[in-house]
Amino acid sequence: MSKGEELFTGVVPILVELDGDVNGHKFSVSGEGEGDATYGKLTLKFICTTGKLPVPWPTLVTTFSYGVQCFSRYPDHMKQHDFFKSAMPEGYVQERTIFFKDDGNYKTRAEVKFEGDTLVNRIELKGIDFKEDGNILGHKLEYNYNSHNVYIMADKQKNGIKVNFKIRHNIEDGSVQLADHYQQNTPIGDGPVLLPDNHYLSTQSALSKDPNEKRDHMVLLEFVTAAGITHGMDELYK
């Protein structure tokens, strides 16, 4: 067990803060909840603290919760491939470019680390080149989320990882908006981290609303499990 993994044996409070600027529309979001890495479970509620969110909530899911991949459940035989927990408590920097097909792009930079007993994800997001009447600024996405696989590989030169995946956002007219994600994570501290073999995270996300909440918000329940690496031969003969 890595030193960082020991911090995730129970339920951990999570705080998410985001500053966004998309085509000049500035906004801030605050999220609170908890994660339980034993089950790969995240429960979070996000509130737009600047009024109405100028982009659809589903476009921010990867930035919020796929940002705290340290809560992914890594099965026993894969724990040596869990970069995310091994970087804690100092944490990691997570940078992404998200290309929305036939529309604009988000660039994000986040610092994910422990502050006391709380896992904090602080994010800055810049969005450019979006069409004012497109699927994103035109709010044409359905309020739901598909399951995805998130592919991870080591980046030895940067002592971190590279991550690629494609998100499928459902559009109200029945079509799909694709969002290509290119991600890299580097540790903040200079301690040893686990550099993984190639594998993937299987994610399932459910979006809902709080019926008692007047503010623009999103409630998120997510389960994430690592997969893609089989038991070694020594495991088979145990």
């Epitope: 803060e17 500053d19 801030s28 509130i47 502050e115 994010i123 800055e124």
Partner: antibody, heavy 117, light 108 residues
């Protein structure tokens, strides 16, 4: 306990500049948005400016846009308001305030800014 | 942008119920917050989220909000409740906080 202490107010001539500071204590400053609200003598409360917890997003009332700049130093637990091109109508008590999600939950005691020749 | 309108003054006898209104278009769809300000002092939050009371605020303070009007109610008003009261709400990302003009509560 949670405390906000403003400083930097005083008498300044029209067209002059002033920098207000707000020292925060008793809470994790970096986790809260912060705002400035002012109150002209005998008048009501007027929101002036706000800054997000991270600090990269700032917001201004139309009456001060282009003249005032809000900033913060999370390492020093301090909020600032740089006021340039001051006018007589900027005369007010300026309050530093903590922003919890979508409302102010804690106020400082205020510092008086007087713009007069 | 939303505009919040309050009566300039309200008078009440000690022990009676004071009601201060705050009106704005579709205000019931937003949360309203109430602040008390005594002379020479900073404002103090007395109601948040329409009807929630912060710790330390007496139970005689309550709030409601529906339609176009929010109301701050002070039951069994005491002399120490004499103050200015401001309603507030949040607006778009253009103006984050909007205050009502304030109501001076006089306890006769």
């Amino acid at each position: 306990q949670v405390q906000l202490v403003e400083s930097g107010g005083g008498l300044v001539q029209p067209g002059g500049s002033l920098r207000l500071s707000c020292a925060a204590s008793g809470f994790t400053f970096s986790r809260y948005g912060m705002h400035w609200v002012r109150q002209a003598p005998g008048k009501g409360l007027e929101w002036v400016s706000g800054i997000s917890s991270i600090g990269s997003n700032t917001y201004y009332a139309d009456s001060v846009k282009g003249r005032f700049t809000i900033s913060r130093d999370n390492s020093k637990n301090t909020l600032y308001l740089q006021m340039n091109s001051l006018r007589a109508e900027d005369t007010a008590v300026y309050y530093c305030a903590r922003w919890y999600k979508t409302y102010i939950d804690v106020w400082g005691q205020g510092t008086l800014v007087t713009v007069s020749s | 942008d939303i505009e919040l309108t309050q009566p300039p003054s309200v008078s009440v006898a000690p022990g009676q119920t004071a009601r201060i209104s705050c009106s704005g278009d579709n205000l019931g769809k937003k949360y309203v917050y109430w602040y008390q300000q005594k002379p020479g002092q900073a404002p103090v939050l007395v109601i948040y989220g329409d009807d929630e009371r912060p710790s330390g605020i007496p139970e005689r303070f309550s709030g409601s909000n529906s339609g176009n009007t929010a109301t701050l109610t002070i039951s069994g008003t005491q002399a120490e409740d004499e103050a200015d009261y401001y309603c507030a709400s949040y607006d778009s990302s253009h103006i984050l906080i909007v205050f009502g003009g304030g109501t001076k509560l006089t306890v006769l």
